[in-house]
Structure formats: C-alpha cells, structure tokens
Interface confidence: medium
C-alpha cells in the first residue's frame, strides 16, 4: 500500500505509443502467503526481542536499547495488521474489514516504516557515537537522551503518516460488488492538481523515509568501517577475526536494509518519473506489475529486523536459549555467561563484565585501546 | 489502425433472438474491456453493456438484463451481443466501442473509468412485427 | 441510476464564438465525467474524459472542468467542424449513463 492514488494511464488510441493496460493479477495466493508468513514470524521475532530487552535490569540498558525496542514495537504494530492485506490481496482487492481498519492499517504501514528508518538511523548513529567517538560522546549516548531521541522520532513518525490516515478510505469505485481501500484525494485536491498531490507526498516519503536515512546510515557505516579498518593494521591476528566479523555484520544489516527497501523506493521513483520522461509502454507495465512485489519485499523487512539486527548477538541467543530453559527448569534468568556476567540486554552499549576494560578476574585486557572491543553492534 | 468493425443487424419480429459480433483490430484485444452503446434513431444514447478483458466481470443496464448477454473470444479478438425477447424499444443503432480505464499505481484493484475511446460504425437492428 | 441532466438542449451560435454546455449530475460522481461529440451518420468520438483530461489528437479549444454533480464543457472560438451533438457521460458508476444530448447549431 501506498500514499499514492490513480495513475492517468490513458493513450489515445490515434496515439501509436498507446499502453494497453489491463486489471493486475496477482500470481494466486503467492503475495497472501508470503503476508502470512511475515505476520507469524514479525509476531514471533518482534515479540522475542521485546522480551529479550524489558527483562534486562535497568541499569544494564544503555542507549541502543531503546531503539531496539523501538524499532520491534514499530514491526510489531505493523505485522499484526498483515493478516488484513493478506485478505484484501486474496479477496482479489475487496475490502471486508470497514473504513476505520482501512485507515489504520494504511497508517500503521507507515507509521512502521518512518519509525523503522528513524530507529535504524539512531541505532546507527548510536554505534557510531560508541564507536568512533566513544569518549566525547559519551553523554550523547546516555539513556535520556535515547529516550527524547525515540519519542522524537515517534512524533516524527506518526506526523509523516497522517496525510494516509487522512486520505485513505473506502469505497465501491464503480458502483460494483467489490470495496476497495485507496487514496482519496479528493477532499484536498481538485482534479488537476490530484497527480501534484500523489508525486509531492511520494517524493517527500521516499526522501524523508529512505534517501535521508540512508545517506546518514551509510556516512555513520562509513566512519566505523574506516575506525574498525585503522585497527586492522594495529592488532594482533587473534584480534584481526573479530573485527572483519563486525565489519562483516555491519555490511549485512545495510545491504539488507537496501535489498528490502531499495526496489519499493527505485520503482516508485521511476514511476512518477515516468509522466515526465515518458517511458515506453513495457517499461511502464513493467513498472506497475513488479511493484506490488517490491512493496512485499519491504514488508518482509520486518520479520527479518529479529533475526538481522538481534540474532548476530551472542547474547540475545543466550538470552532465547535463557527463556527456553526458563520455560522448562523455571530458572529465573540468571544464567551465567562464560564471562562470568549474567545474561544482560543483548543490545547494551558495553560489557557488563567486572569493570572498564576489564576481562575475567579484573585483569587488564588487550584489546584497551580500541573503544569498540566490547560494544555488541547492533543495527537494524 | 485501431478499428471495430459491429455486423449481425437486422430485421426481427418481437420476442425474437438477435446476435451481434464485433470483429476488432489494430490492437491488443485481450487487454481491454469492451462495451455495446446504442442510439435510438433521432434520440440519444445509451450504455447497454460491458465486459472485462478476461469475461469474468459483465454490466448491464438494467432494461436488457436476463434478456441480453455480453460474450467475447479472446483468440478470434470478437466481442458478441446476444439478445433474446426483442422489443420494439430495443430498436437502434448497435455500437461496439473500446473501454479505457486508469489503473491505481499504488492501490492494486482500484481502477478508475474513462469511457470509450474507440468506436465501430454501427450495425442497425429493428424490432418490428 | 445516476441522471445526467444536460442543458441547452440545443443552441445556435456563430463561428468563432465560445461554447459552454452543461451538465448536471443528480448525485456526486467525483470527477468522472466525459464528453463525446457526434455528427450525424456518425460514431461518437470521444474529446474529454475524467472531466479535464483531453482525448488525444483533440484540439485544445475544446476543455473541460467541474466536479462532483456540475460539469462543463467548453468550446473557445468554434470552428466549423465542432458543429455537432455533444453528449456527457458519467463514468462513477453501473450503469453508465449518458445526458440527452447538446445540438450545436450554426447560427
């Protein structure tokens, strides 16, 4: 689902370079399924993760925590409204469920991915700041400031989305049996300006929720792969694998970031470049049949946020493997790492080992010169 | 060249069976929905029926409806007009003509109707006893 | 069934001058609309649709505008070949129905 609304598609027919356009078909219940799919493991994984850091004690979480669970709660309020989509699409795009749901599934699509960047980009920044510029900023990185930067980005997030809550609707377009949920720009545009309306918050989406965050991403990405990359040269080979290992982490979470998000963005982008450049007319069809694909691929972006921005933990495992064991021995989650420490937040800025730099037993470790040995990077 | 091409007019007695073919060319037949529109002579017109592309979606107005029935062969690119019970008012001037809609980008099924851009001749039919 | 209601009936005018027709729907159609011409012995041709989106290959003298249940087309500085009928048809919903007609007449 979009922000968008109707496409003037029309060719004349004395025009030689007409679109022959036709009802989209999706491929069977392939889009439903795949929905489902994301509901049950988004539901799973998100709720995992939010377990995973409200049973942590408070004074072990530190600032990265608060966009992780973010950035969860944000795929959770979406997914569990999958289930909607996957009858819509399955009902062949008839509508069931009432205006009210139409509107706040609509938002909630939204709201997700706004939050979803914004949290990814402040988790982001957060490992940047721990990182790159762990002793200037370490105030930066306090719990308060995450939790102003959160309820900012929240605020942030829901205002984006309002023109959907606003212009989604529903409606039986041709008088027919069959009830669509679509964009309804009527109440704020006349009829010439509709196409203003669809391109303007299309561009403003695609900029303020991909490009904008992106670009920060990749410039914080840029500057930890450039510190990690100074230390290769320094360290001992002991400390050379695990520093590719997190460079290697780092490279996954944005490349997946862009796989699942790129192709919705790029498509749309160079559909509303199409009015103006003209497209030829397979290249449009083209366009207009793959995108219900692509926004698919950025729905599945939420299920796999768990298993990509969490899962690459040590701790978070140890923390699931905790939970297992709590629900058969009702141990109660005080199992002890090899470290010595007991399983904390799996997202926590640092160690929470015996002390600063401190290893097993308090001795000093090695790695002390590099800010970065003990953060858990964790991205979404 | 685009063209629609309408045939099977004629004379028939009231309650009599009538059918009417459309032979299109030009372009991409499978693709569009299609519409019958007649004109009685020295009156207006009016919308009798449409078909989607694949024949799973049919409209009637309300007049010929459990009387007539819209058909199409995708592989001979025909439309048809069956029509049974005849009436002296369903004496006109048959048109065929080619459906245009406007396809929601974003919102998949939503679709938007801009009426009828390609039109055949005609093919006369008369009612009369 | 949605009425369209088209007014003048008919009118007489001269060569050059501007042509405004009405019509009105008898419930909100949004911007559905569209306007087709015909001469006599001939198909309708279609020269608007969706209210002000113009048919490729009509001449831009011909436009149109409105929404929800009053439209109009207009015709600036008539030419000889737009003498004809002209017809609306609102396209919001089944059945699809056309207005009465508007006879332009040479003066």
């Known amino acids: 689902m979009e922000e968008g609304g109707d496409f003037d598609n029309y060719y004349g027919a004395d025009n030689q370079s007409e679109c022959e356009y036709t009802d989209w078909k999706s491929s069977g219940a392939l889009i439903p399924a795949i929905y489902m799919l994301v509901f049950l493991l988004g539901t799973t994984g998100n709720g995992l993760v939010l377990w995973t850091v409200f049973r942590s004690s408070r004074e072990k979480r530190r600032s990265a925590d608060i966009f992780i669970a973010s950035l969860a709660v944000a795929d959770l309020t979406f997914v569990v409204t999958l289930p909607l989509w996957a009858t819509y699409t399955y009902r062949d795009y008839d509508w069931p469920f009432g205006t009210f749901f139409c509107k706040l599934s609509s938002y909630l699509i939204f709201v997700n991915m706004y939050a979803s960047v914004f949290c990814l980009t402040g988790l982001s920044f957060d490992r940047y700041l721990a990182i790159v510029r762990p002793v200037a900023n370490a105030r930066l990185r306090l719990r308060v400031s995450g939790a102003v930067a959160t309820a900012v980005l929240w605020v942030l997030a829901a205002l984006l989305a309002m023109p959907v809550m606003v212009l989604r609707t529903t409606g039986d377009l041709e008088n027919t049996t069959k009830v669509q949920c679509y964009m309804d720009y009527s109440m704020v545009a006349t009829v010439s300006s509709e196409w203003a309306w669809e391109v303007g918050l299309g561009v403003s989406s695609t900029t303020v929720g991909f490009v904008v965050p992106f670009t920060i991403m990749l410039t914080c990405y840029f500057f930890i792969a450039q510190t990690i990359a100074g230390h290769f040269r320094k360290e001992r080979i002991e400390g050379l694998r695990k520093r590719r290992r997190l460079l290697s982490i780092i490279v996954v979470l944005v490349v997946t970031f862009a796989l699942c998000w790129m192709p919705y963005h790029l498509v749309k982008t160079l559909y509303m470049l199409g009015s103006l450049l003209h497209w030829p007319c397979d290249f449009d069809l083209f366009l207009m049949n793959i995108f219900p694909y692509c926004t698919c691929i950025s729905y599945v972006n939420s299920c796999l946020n768990p298993f990509l921005y969490a899962f690459f933990d040590p701790r978070f495992r140890q923390a699931c493997t905790s939970m297992l064991c709590c629900g058969q021995s009702r141990c109660a989650g005080t199992s002890h790492s090899s470290s010595g420490e007991k399983s904390a937040s799996y997202s926590s800025g640092h160690s929470q080992g015996p002390g600063p730099n401190m290893g097993k037993g308090g001795e000093q470790m090695h790695e002390k010169s590099i800010p970065y040995s003990q953060e858990t990077l964790v991205v979404d | 060249e685009v063209q629609l091409v309408e045939s099977g007019g004629g004379l028939v007695q009231p309650g009599g069976s009538l059918r009417l073919s459309c032979a299109a060319s030009g372009f991409t037949f499978s693709s569009f929905w299609m519409s019958w529109v007649r004109q009685v002579p020295g009156k207006g017109l009016e919308w009798v029926a449409n078909?989607?592309?694949?024949?799973?979606?049919?409209y009637y107005v309300d007049s010929v409806k459990g009387r007539f029935t819209i058909s199409r062969d995708n592989a001979k690119n025909s439309l048809y007009l069956q029509m049974n019970s005849l009436r002296a008012e369903d004496t006109a001037v048959y048109y065929c003509a080619r459906d245009r809609f406007g396809y929601s980008f974003y919102d998949k099924g939503v679709r938007y109707y801009y009426g009828m851009d390609v039109w055949g001749q005609g093919t006369t039919v008369t009612v009369s006893s | 069934d949605i009425q369209m209601t088209q007014s003048p009936s008919s009118l007489s005018v001269s060569v050059g001058d501007r042509v405004t027709i009405t019509c009105r729907a008898s419930?909100?159609?949004?911007?559905?609309l569209g306007w087709y011409q015909q001469k006599p012995g001939k198909a309708p041709k279609r020269l608007i649709y969706a209210t002000s989106s113009l048919q490729s290959g009509v001449p831009s003298r011909f436009s149109g505008s409105g929404s929800g249940t009053e439209f109009t087309l207009t015709i600036s500085g008539l030419q000889p070949e737009d003498f004809a009928t002209y017809y609306c048809?609102?396209?919001?919903?089944?059945?699809?129905?056309f207005g009465q007609g508007t006879k332009v007449e040479i003066k």
């Open positions: 078909i989607k592309q694949d024949g799973s979606e049919k």
């Open positions: 048809l609102q396209h919001n919903s089944y059945p699809r129905t």
């Open positions: 419930q909100g159609i949004r911007n559905d």
